[in-house]
């Protein structure tokens, strides 16, 4: 069995976590991807998902979480903006490949958010409206569910994370839930 590893990131309230999860390009480019939180003894909880199928460089925003899937580079970019202390926890990127269980992209991210002023670019959440004007939709599921089997093999890629920099700046206020319309059986 593969040993699960973690990378620890310590950030201040108001900062942005910026995670890049690598995946095998030819296998998973269009697969739906998600950002999950893992808590001891519990089923992982999906917090946000890409479209189904995943669209190239198309930002999906759910609350303070923004997902972007860069097919050309084989990476899923996850940003959690305006971090709060309660965001602290263990996270992972996964690829949905129903009916198989989600495939985890290594490493897991151990996020520790502490109180304290941050002057990090992108940490001021009071200035502008949403960067991404995605029309809100009403949907049954947080993540659209596949209705037919898809078989894929997998390799364990790696994830990296860093604090936001000016070129990844995003300012959000009055964040609303932006989710997609699913297909159901």
């Amino acid at each position: 069995a593969t040993k699960l590893t973690e990378e620890k990131y310590e950030l201040k309230e108001g900062q942005t976590l910026d995670v890049k999860c690598d995946y095998t390009l030819e296998k998973f480019a269009s697969s739906q991807k998600a950002w999950q939180i893992i808590r001891d003894g519990e089923m992982p909880k999906t917090l946000a998902c890409t479209e189904r199928p995943s669209k190239n460089s198309h930002p999906v925003q759910v609350g303070r979480i923004i997902l972007e899937d860069y097919h050309d580079h084989g990476l899923l970019r996850v940003r959690m903006v305006n971090l709060q202390v309660e965001d602290s926890g263990l996270y992972q990127c996964v690829i949905y490949q129903p009916p198989k269980e989600p495939h985890m992209l290594f490493d897991r991210i151990r996020l520790v958010v502490t109180k304290g002023f941050s002057g990090t670019p992108g940490s001021n959440e009071n200035s502008t409206q949403n960067v991404y004007k995605i029309p809100p939709t009403t949907t049954k599921a947080l993540c659209p569910l596949y209705t037919s089997p898809r078989t894929v093999t997998q390799a364990p890629p790696k994830s990296t994370a860093d604090v936001s920099t000016p070129d990844s700046e995003i300012n959000l206020t009055n964040v609303t839930d932006i989710i997609r319309v699913p297909v159901f059986n």
Partner: antibody, heavy 121, light 113 residues
Amino acid sequence: QLQLQESGPGLVKPSETLSLTCTVSGGSISSSSYYWGWIRQPPGKGLEWIGSIYYSGSTYYNPSLKSRVTISVDTSKNQFSLKLSSVTAADTAVYYCARDLGQYEGYFDLWGRGTLVTVSS
Amino acid sequence: DIVMTQSPDSLAVSLGERATINCKSSQSVLFSSNNKNYLAWYQQKPGQPPKLLIYWASTRESGVPDRFSGSGSGTDFTLTISSLQAEDVAVYYCQQYFSTPPTFGGGTKVEIK
């Protein structure tokens, strides 16, 4: 239209094992991303989640029942099953199977009609 | 485990009048990161299984009449039936799915006055 139907003995003796099966019709248990769960309701009382299973066999159990519960799945028969060991009168309840949106959501959007299981000698 | 407490235990309302059911969780069921409250409401009529009415605290399940609405955030939630109909006589349950195990409230019985 997807339907769930519970089946199994309506009477179980104390200290024995309660065994129930849920048959899924109108769709394949293994062709979507749902978990499948068991919930029970003692007569005149509230609802208690017992546990849930994915078609691959991954399970999550209620810690209060974990030592006595086994949930399994048989994809060839489109069924999943519940076994509850060492039962007592407190396990008398209507047992429901339900579709569980699992790690995607966590609520139960489709339920079987339920089957009453009485624990008595 | 998260404890879900419903009030009142029972409620008698005249036809066409508003019915309000409260649900309180022992800890927040809101993930602030995605702004989602992991709370659902169910309706259970005698001899029937529960039926999903509301999820994400305020989103109506497909086919549920719009007289049913859910509101609230964090630890305090409300199910409102804006104009009670005879077919709404049932027991209503809230359920949190924020953490394992998912837990249900004790139920509120709604009757016609």
